[in-house]
């Protein structure tokens, strides 16, 4: 190779200056006794190269680009050879930003997959390859003292979430959890969460059902609906509170919320509704009185109220 480029830094902050030098070996000077070294950034010729012959006979050109405003570009040095440009060497330049502090880190415990799933917002685009690592440790107290470290959790490329499997979790004990972002320009860390995985448990919702009419039970009053729900079995031993929402199927009415309902109110009569109207109903639950996350809303149940106009409006439930 006749030429070689070296740069002050191949990766810089976007907008920062960069200095490069191109050296042509003496044994290449047959190309031209006094070769003029040219610089090109991408497709554009760059003026301002300062050229000199060194004591060993090699030629050197130094250029300073005052602002690298491209997130990625190739810088090349070349010689005029006949009517064409002969490229001697080229380097890839990258420019971007150090990672911002990841924010909005939150986690939930999924009892079905037996894993703690944490997600975060990575912040603005850095324009550079940036890796995220979910880091954690076990702690007996309030995470001021660090216990055993837990194996780093590395998300798949482009994802801003990661799952810590059960074997690395201690239930009913606190864990310190944070996200570390790293690229060629720096490292940043999110604020640390201190949590007991069970305090961020997200349950599955119960299954809503129509209450089977029994011969001895009174039929529902007009404007009332009778329904029941089947709790999610794996969460049965977790104290929960639930809430119901309903809206007429037709029209633009918004959801009306009813609750809190205890999980064990497995039968419910919902009154004060429009007569002879089809309603959509959903239910969701949360660990309570201990901390937790609301479940998703259950699949919808569609029921129709009876014809007669209601005589009065009220809510009540039967155990």
């Amino acid at each position: 190779e006749c030429g070689h480029i070296s740069v002050s830094a191949p990766i810089v902050h976007l907008g920062d200056p960069i200095t490069a030098s191109c050296i042509i070996k003496q044994n290449c000077s047959h190309l031209d006794p006094e070769p003029q070294i040219l610089w090109r950034l991408g497709a554009e010729l760059q003026p301002g190269g300062r050229q000199q012959r060194l004591s060993d006979g090699t030629q050197e050109s130094i250029i300073t680009l005052p602002h690298l405003n491209h997130t990625q570009a190739f810088l090349s040095c070349a010689l005029n050879w006949g009517n064409s440009l002969q490229i001697l060497d080229q380097v890839e330049l990258r420019a971007g930003y150090p990672p911002a502090i990841p924010h909005n880190l939150s986690c939930l415990m999924n009892l079905t997959t037996s894993s703690l799933i944490c997600q975060w917002e990575p912040g603005p685009e850095t324009h550079l390859p940036t890796s995220f690592t979910l880091k954690s440790f076990k702690s007996r107290g309030n995470c001021q003292t660090q216990g055993d470290s837990i194996l780093d959790c590395v998300p798949k490329d482009g994802q801003s979430h990661c799952s810590i499997p059960r074997k690395h979790l201690l239930l009913y004990q606190n864990m310190g959890i944070w996200v570390q972002a790293e690229n060629a320009l720096g490292t940043s860390m999110s604020p640390q969460l201190c949590l007991d995985p069970m305090d961020v448990v997200k349950l599955e919702p119960p299954m809503l059902r129509t209450m089977d009419p029994s011969p001895e039970a009174a039929p529902p009053q007009a404007g009332c609906l009778q329904l029941s729900w089947e709790p999610w079995q794996p969460g049965l031993h977790i104290n929960q509170k639930c809430e119901l929402r309903h809206k007429p199927q037709r029209g633009e009415a918004s959801w009306a919320l009813v609750g809190p309902l205890p999980l064990e109110a497995l039968q419910y009569e919902l009154c004060g509704l429009l007569p002879a109207t089809a309603y959509t109903l959903q239910i969701r639950c949360i660990r309570w009185p201990l901390p937790g996350h609301w479940s998703d809303w259950s699949p919808s149940l569609e029921l129709r109220t009876t014809e007669r106009a209601p005589t009065h409006h009220h809510h009540h439930h039967h155990h």
Epitope: L111, T112, T113, S114, R166, K167, L171, M198, P231, Q233, P234, L236, H237, I238, N239, P262, E264, A265, L266, P289, H319
Partner: antibody
């Protein structure tokens, strides 16, 4: 410290009845599921029944369904098992257990022996 | 009902031995698997819950692993006080079935 103390066991004739009690202390009784597990002489453990924190959900083993009734009095921190139509095969040590949020029996009483024999 | 099958039903081992007991569920139970230790004339004691969580006060030589249908209780270095009968139990749904038990005896 969690303590569970069973009482009410004894000798009863086939077809007879017995009521077991379990007095709980050292934890907030009204927040936890409770249960009964039994162990026939020389045999393994057999789950009998459980009851939810407020008493609204009461699953039973098929072997006792319709004959045994589990209940609780949260004001007295006491769990009960009413056993009717007792059979010889109900002879066992009956343990009261506090259940954790994942269904585990996290604390056990010392057990009370029920003998059904003529 | 979910059936629980434990193996072996008994084993002989020496102090310091590594002991492994397995438990298989007839259908998937996620991680809802608990292990208990029972000594003669005593009430059972919870060792491991949710497949791998050590109950407070239980020595760290006890560990649990597995998920779905196959689970393992391991005692890394058997101590004299560990000679007992061990039971697994599923708690994902009712009826909560126990395994048949594994008696660990002195060789």
């Amino acid at each position: 410290e969690v303590q569970l103390l069973e009482s009410g066991g004894g000798l009863v004739q086939p077809g007879g009845s017995l009521r077991l009690s379990c007095a709980a202390s050292g934890f907030t009784f009204s927040l936890y599921w409770m249960g009964w597990v039994r162990q026939a002489p020389g045999k393994g453990l057999e789950w009998v029944s459980s009851i939810s924190s407020s008493g609204g959900v009461t699953p039973y083993a098929d072997s006792v369904k319709g004959r045994f009734t589990i209940s609780r009095d949260n004001s007295k921190n006491t769990l009960y098992l009413q056993m009717n139509s007792l059979r010889a095969e109900d002879t066992a040590v009956y343990y009261c257990a506090k259940l954790g949020e994942l269904g585990q029996s996290s604390a056990w009483g010392q057990g009370t022996l029920v003998t059904v024999s003529s | 009902d979910i059936q629980m099958t434990q193996s072996p039903s008994s084993l002989s081992a020496s102090v310091g031995d590594r002991v492994t007991i397995t438990c298989r569920a007839s259908q998937g139970i996620s991680s809802y698997l608990n292990w208990y230790q029972q000594k003669p004339g005593k009430a059972p004691k919870l060792l491991i819950y949710y497949a791998s969580n050590l109950q407070n006060g239980v020595p760290s030589r006890f560990s649990g692993s597995g998920s779905g249908t196959d689970f393992t209780l391991t005692i890394s270095s058997l101590q004299p006080e560990d000679f007992a009968t061990y039971y697994c139990q599923q708690s994902i749904q009712y009826p909560q079935m126990f395994g048949g038990g594994t008696k660990v005896e002195i060789k």
